[in-house]
């Protein structure tokens, strides 16, 4: 599936996301992870998802954003983190979204 550009795994019970996902799907532009059980994001989580334009993370249990998980997403247009457990609008330790 290396040519895949859109992946919808919404409404599952995914609690951990392996960073190698995007290494195996280098063309991925749209990733929908809504309504899963993710609790944390790190700067490794999407490090290899450099072509993403849309990332849907709404309705998870994300409470911890460690370091700068979106710093490599130079093409990101849509990021949805609604309905999570974030206590701050700070999405990491530096400005990441240009």
């Amino acid at each position: 599936y290396s040519q895949l550009t859109s992946l919808d795994v919404g409404f599952n019970t995914i609690s951990k996301l392996e960073p190698e996902l995007c290494q195996k799907l280098p063309m991925l532009k749209v990733l929908n992870l809504q309504h899963n059980e993710l609790s944390q994001l790190s700067d490794k989580t999407f490090a290899f998802c450099t072509n993403l334009t849309e990332l849907h993370l709404m309705s998870n249990s994300i409470q911890k954003i460690k370091n700068n998980p979106f710093v490599k997403q130079k093409n990101l247009i849509t990021l949805d983190l609604s309905h999570n457990g974030l206590s701050s609008t700070k999405l990491g330790t530096q400005v990441q979204l240009e």
Epitope: E18, P19, E20, Q23, S39, Q40, S42, K44, T45, A47, Q63, K64, K66, S87
Partner: antibody, heavy 117, light 107 residues
Framework: EVQLQQSGAELGKPGTSVKLSCKVS????????MHWVNQRPGKGLEWIGR????????IYGEDFKTKATLTADTSSNTAYMQLSQLKSDDTAIYFC??????????WGQGVMVTVSS | DIQMTQSPPSLSASLGETVSIECLAS??????LAWYQQRSGKSPQLLIY???RLQDGVPSRFSGSGSGTRYSLKISGMQPEDEADYFC?????????FGSGTKLEIK
């Protein structure tokens, strides 16, 4: 299956150095952080530091900034820790561990380092 | 550095009994807490992360709870294989720090 295989026990003389290795199978270390933790005889766990194998960036605990040097080789999927200027209180079991979020999902079996003249 | 004060240092429990271990952080750690089990002569094994999330493959008799500075690990129904040392660890801030451990023995 993810496995962390550490090198064998080390006997070092005071003032010398030892280099420990931790070979990871079943997971690419570029996708995580490699940590090192020690446990002195009969004692608890103490964090030494961690390395990001993707770029070599390291963070050390205060007591280990001049004691430990962490490196990683992504081509062999191996992390290393060098302990320098060995002293008797460096005698401990040293564990490598993997963790993307600074807790440790997987651990090596541990290696005993004994410092004695 | 964040100090992790773990109690009790040792604990004896009968098979089937429910036991709790506590960890108190010197400042708030926002649920960035993990619990490990270390059987004699073995490496530690992750039980709980993010204060209450059960690591894959860990029996459901283990549970974690807490918030702010105070956290606990509960074993609901002690089993022979639960005889081990238990450690908490904060991953909120560097340097990462561990509690001093609790030795759990079968009565």
């Amino acid at each position: 299956e993810v496995q962390l295989q550490q090198s064998g026990a080390e006997l070092g003389k005071p003032g010398t150095s030892v280099k420990l290795s931790c070979k990871v199978s079943g997971y690419n270390i570029r996708y995580t952080y490699m940590h090192w933790v020690n446990q002195r005889p009969g004692k608890g766990l103490e964090w030494i530091g961690r390395i990001d194998p993707a770029n070599g960036d390291s963070i050390y605990g205060e007591d280990f900034k001049t004691k430990a040097t962490l490196t990683a080789d992504t081509s062999s999927n191996t992390a290393y820790m060098q302990l320098s200027q060995l002293k008797s209180d460096d005698t401990a079991i040293y564990f490598c561990a993997m963790g993307e979020f600074d807790y440790f999902d997987y651990w090596g079996q541990g290696v005993m380092v004994t410092v004695s003249s | 550095d964040i100090q992790m004060t773990q109690s009790p240092p040792s604990l004896s429990a009968s098979l089937g009994e429910t036991v709790s271990i506590e960890c108190l952080a010197s400042e708030g750690i926002s649920n960035d807490l993990a619990w490990y089990q270390q059987r004699s002569g073995k490496s530690p094994q992750l039980l709980i992360y993010a204060a209450s999330r059960l690591q894959d493959g860990v029996p459901s008799r283990f549970s974690g709870s807490g918030s702010g500075t105070r956290y606990s690990l509960k074993i609901s129904g002690m089993q022979p294989e639960d005889e081990a040392d238990y450690f908490c660890q904060q991953n909120y801030k560097y340097p990462l720090t561990f509690g001093s451990g609790t030795k759990l023995e079968i009565k």
